[in-house]
Amino acid sequence: SPYSSDTTPCCFAYIARPLPRAHIKEYFYTSGKCSNPAVVFVTRKNRQVCANPEKKWVREYINSLEMS
């Protein structure tokens, strides 16, 4: 999950596997102030998971979340 410093959440590691799409309810990008660019997926259990925005499955999920 993202590490919060001065209320700005940043990610220092990415999930290495696809999350079930049906378990994800929303997403947000971490701040440009963070050293690593990241997408944070929020699951239906309200867990926050850091993901690599360059991964194909991450881009696919973002597209489908934008359309829904």
Epitope: I15, A16, R17, P18, L19, P20, R21, A22, H23, T43, K45, R47, V49, K55, K56, W57, E60, Y61, S64
Partner: antibody, heavy 119, light 108 residues
């Protein structure tokens, strides 16, 4: 080094259940996803389901929904796959597989457990 | 659900190049993994994320993914490469891992 060691071969009658175990060494069970894949004689690989640690949930392939249960005993670092209402088509080699190394792909596999369903 | 199509068999002479294809609708939008399985053994990951190679896998194994086809290429084929090869992707529409039907590589 991550290793998965599975339980021995089983022979079951139609309608019975089978429970296959997969003992993990070299890492903690909850760290990575654990999947189960089966292979009928002379056929291809078929994903049955798996545990998603970040989500804390197990997902099952539609085909096996309601008939398969995957559990984990974190105290012994052992994963289990139980398949009920067995029929002859369930005769197969059952593998556990995990993804500790390369981007979600199944990089470590158990040796396989042969399950034979015969009356 | 998502379908991956592989040729049932591919034959190649030793020292030649083998190409095993995996077809799927817009497969280039997905990360493809490849496994090698020898008789009586568990599968072994040989390529992940389209074209990356796990440590210990020879450089002769490479992968590509474009359009509707992913390809596993084995250059300078050896007798020991004879095996079944399976492609795999994550299908987010069903939240299922999907395997291709497998390709039997025969070294002549």
């Amino acid at each position: 080094q991550v290793q998965l060691v599975q339980s021995g071969a089983e022979v079951k009658k139609p309608g019975a259940s089978v429970k296959v175990s997969c003992k993990v060494s070299g890492y903690t069970l909850t760290e990575f996803a654990m999947h189960w894949v089966r292979q009928a004689p002379g056929k291809g690989l078929e994903w049955m389901g798996g545990f998603v640690p970040e989500d804390g949930e197990t997902i099952y392939a539609q085909k096996f929904q309601g008939r398969v249960t995957m559990t984990e005993d974190t105290s012994t670092d052992t994963a289990y796959m139980e398949l009920s209402s067995l029929r002859s088509e369930d005769t197969a080699v059952y593998y556990c597989a995990t993804d500790p190394l390369y981007e979600g792909s199944f990089s470590v596999w158990g040796q396989g457990t042969t399950v034979t369903v015969s009356s | 659900s998502y379908v991956l199509t592989q040729p049932p068999s591919v034959s190649v002479a030793p020292g030649q190049t083998a190409r095993i294809t995996c077809g799927g609708n817009n497969i280039e939008s997905k990360s493809v993994h490849w496994y090698q399985q020898k008789p009586g053994q568990a599968p072994v990951l040989v390529v992940y994320d389209d074209s990356d190679r796990p440590s210990g896998i020879p450089e002769r194994f490479s992968g590509s993914n474009s359009g509707n086809t992913a390809t596993l290429t084995i250059s300078r084929v050896e007798a020991g490469d004879e095996a079944d090869y399976y492609c795999q992707v994550w299908d987010s529409n069903t939240d299922h891992w999907v395997f291709g039907g497998g390709t039997k590589l025969t070294v002549l």
